[in-house]
């Protein structure tokens, strides 16, 4: 019996098609992606094949202003629309609390939302009770296939899921749950979740009836052969890993941003067995067109975004100095506000010793496109926000050694007055350095805020310490020469959307005026 | 639990025919194929033909095309192997065999002989 | 068609003994390759599919690898309840084709 799982992950509010990069689209032509795109595609594979499910692993919020303005409304219509088979709950749909995935999505949901591992507990478990399941089994063609959530265990360092719902360890929550399948008599069972690949894999082995496992969250991308576009392939599609029960399992995942469709092809016996599986991500590029209907239905939401960009966030009664001229030589304000906006972006108050799980920011001064002049009656818009932050990144949290922030510091002024990128604005550091040493010894001094403290200080950074810190994802992939930071990162958890947190933020102070305070020396 | 279950032996006369029928439970009989494979005493297993349940269609390896006829009946779950013109040679033990060769009948003797 | 030599046609071993059995394909089946076990009483099972899978129940004293035209089925630690006749068997293509048999018996 042969079934064919499309499936996407990490499409983050990217329903309009996309650049190449997954950034605005500008020439249509060349542009990629979107829900009208992948709808004639994935249309196309159900008139061909008999036996299909459309699966999504998480992470549709978060990532556009669509998110911002809709708030998962969007996410709902369109996959209700798209006629989704299943869904996992990722991180980022807990991002406006737990009220902000139940009313525009698990309610207007016409699809199952899967977790596992998340139990609700308190007031919030009859609330939530029954619009996320565990598992569902869902009917396909003759046969019936069982499909199971699970949602990365660190949500509440990286969302806000609130305190009433306790994120359990993946492989010990899905067991249960896969052997109650099995006594339903359901021998298919799919692990589709928000975890990242290397959990992928160790659910792959280690959950003993899990036949295939399809996942989110690293963005991984998988191929087998010439990979169609930019994207390096960390490994062949499917993965197939080895269970400790000696089983092939295939583990796949999609990248992200909507840009491929995943399509894989498994075989099963009579006994639930995978027999063969083979398939690829599909690029969704302009040779694929979109689909009227949705494409209208787009063009229709639309309208409320062009609105919402000129609308005013808040105030600022000082110069917000992103320029060129400061951000690249010196600390600039700019700099600061967006460090300040993207701690409190993360704050989590998840364990007493704590004050926060995060107190440092890294930000490439190169990253600041604009300033934005108080003179125009201080109105901080969308639009403004769009000029400052213009690449679509996201603010990414990273577990990084002493060491490799050192290392950072030091290349952020190794060429120091040529006017480059790699300048690095900050917030929760304090840095001394000394321009007048030769480059990759310039940094005597470098202070951290403490996290494990009541009252926030100061401290020498220690070489060894394993230190959390909110960047840029250009940084964390490594861009403007940040090499260390890519190769020697211990753990990298995609964020919110840079204009979102910053104007998140804006609209919660209301009035702002940050200052030049000496973060930087 | 798969289970299949074939009927008993049988004595044929050469230049006759017979029908071995097996009954399958425990699983979603119109989704998958039957493959049925012969066993002639002493010697190795050969692979006969299948046919999928759903809408009949049939694949036969070219030694038996001609000669044998698989058929199926899907309100009783059965699927049937008929092999036409016996010579002594036909003598064997007919397995009948779920998609992929998971699940076995218990086999059944065919003996060709005047 | 694909032929499937396999060998050897018989080997004698104890217990304990770690025993492979080999097939080797005419031309490439990608993992299309299933482990079958025929006691003496009649009974097949399957053991392996798609080259290196364990059937549900089997014990992990049996493995199998290979990939293209060569494959082999190892029992790491030979069983008294082990002795029996051992067949390969293709199905990448049509025909699917049988191995000959191995017969491990008792030495």
């Known amino acids: 019996w042969e079934l064919t799982i499309l499936h996407t992950n990490d499409v983050h509010s990217r329903l309009e098609q996309t650049s190449e990069d997954s950034s605005k689209c500008v020439n249509a032509s060349r542009c990629m992606g979107g829900v009208a795109r992948l709808f004639t595609k994935v249309q196309q594979i159900r008139r061909a094949e008999p036996n299909v499910l459309l699966l999504d692993a998480g992470d549709q919020y978060q990532g556009t202003i669509w998110f911002t303005v809709y708030k998962g409304a969007e996410v709902a219509h369109f996959m209700n629309a798209l006629r989704y088979d299943a869904m996992a709950l990722g991180n980022h749909e807990f991002d406006n609390g737990v009220e902000g995935l139940i009313e525009p999505l698990l309610k207007e949901a016409k699809f199952p939302i899967l977790s596992a591992n998340i139990k609700a507990k308190g007031p919030l478990a009859s609330q939530i009770s029954g619009l996320y399941l565990p598992y569902k089994v869902l009917p396909v063609g003759d046969e019936v296939v069982g499909i199971v959530g699970y949602t990365s265990k660190e949500t509440p360092f990286l969302s806000n899921p609130g305190t009433n719902l306790v994120f359990e360890d993946e492989i010990t929550a899905l067991q249960p749950e896969v052997d109650k399948l099995k006594t339903l008599n359901v021998n298919k069972i799919i692990a589709l979740g928000h975890s990242g690949f290397e959990m992928d894999k160790l659910i792959a082995q280690k959950v003993r009836g899990v036949d295939v496992v399809v996942g989110g969250h690293s963005n991984t991308f998988l191929y087998t052969g010439n990979p169609p576009s930019k994207e390096v392939p960390a490994g062949k599609y499917p993965f197939i890993v080895t269970s400790d029960d000696g089983r092939k399992v295939p583990v796949v995942q999609a990248y992200a941003f909507g840009k491929y469709l995943g399509y894989l092809k498994i075989e099963f016996d009579e006994r639930g067995n995978v027999i063969s599986s083979h398939g690829n991500p599909i690029l969704l590029n302009s040779s694929i067109p979109e689909d009227p209907s949705i494409k209208a239905d787009i063009n229709k939401w639309r309208i409320k975004l062009d609105n919402y960009s000129t609308q005013e966030l808040g105030k600022t009664i000082v110069y917000l100095d992103g320029s060129s001229q400061s951000c690249r030589f010196r600390e600039c304000n700019m700099g600061n506000l967006i460090c300040d906006a993207m701690i409190n972006n993360n704050l989590r108050h998840t364990d007493e010793m704590f004050w926060n799980h995060v107190s440092m920011c890294i930000l490439n001064g190169g990253g600041i496109r604009s300033p934005i002049d108080e003179r125009n009656n201080g109105t901080i818009t969308w639009e403004n926000l769009a000029a400052v932050l213009p690449f679509g990144g996201t603010f990414d949290l990273v577990q990084l050694k002493g060491s490799t922030l050192k290392k950072a510091f030091e290349h952020s002024v190794h060429r120091y007055g040529q006017s480059t990128g790699e300048f690095l604005q900050v917030g929760g550091i304090h840095v001394v350095y000394d321009l007048s040493r030769k480059p990759g010894d310039r940094v005597v001094k470098l202070d951290v805020l403490c996290t494990k403290c009541r009252v926030p200080s100061y401290d020498p950074l220690k070489m060894d310490e394993v230190y959390k810190v909110i960047l840029p994802n250009f940084l964390a992939n490594g861009g403007d020469g940040f090499q260390m930071i890519k190769d020697e990162l211990l753990r990298h958890d995609s964020g919110d959307q840079d204009i979102n947190v910053v104007s998140t933020y804006i609209s919660k102070m209301k009035v702002i005026y940050p200052a030049v305070e000496g973060r930087i020396k | 639990e798969v289970q299949l279950v074939q009927s008993g032996a049988e004595v044929k006369k050469p230049g006759a025919s017979v029908k071995v029928s097996c009954k399958a439970s425990g699983y979603t009989f119109t989704a998958y194929f039957m493959n049925w494979v012969m066993q002639a005493p002493g010697q190795g297993l050969e692979w006969i033909g299948r046919i999928y349940h759903n809408n009949g269609d049939t694949f036969y390896s070219q030694k038996f095309k001609g000669r044998a006829t698989l058929t199926v009946d899907k309100s009783t779950s059965t699927v049937y192997m008929e092999l036409s013109s016996l010579r002594s040679e036909d003598t064997a033990v007919y397995y009948c065999a779920t998609s992929y060769v998971g699940d076995w009948g218990q086999g059944t003797t065919v003996t060709v002989s005047s | 068609d694909i032929q499937m030599t396999q060998s050897p046609s018989s080997l004698s071993a104890s217990v304990g003994d770690r025993v492979t059995i080999t097939c080797r394909a005419s031309q490439d089946i990608g993992d299309s390759l299933n482990w079958l076990q025929q006691k003496p009483g009649g009974a097949l099972k399957r053991l392996i599919y798609?080259?290196?899978s364990l059937d549900s129940g089997v014990p992990s004293r049996f493995s199998g690898s290979g990939s293209g035209t060569e494959y082999t089925l190892t029992i790491s630690s030979l069983q008294p309840e082990d002795f029996a006749t051992y067949y390969c068997l293709q199905y990448a293509s049509f025909p699917w084709t049988f191995g000959g048999g191995t017969k491990v018996e008792i030495k």
């Open positions: 798609a080259t290196s």
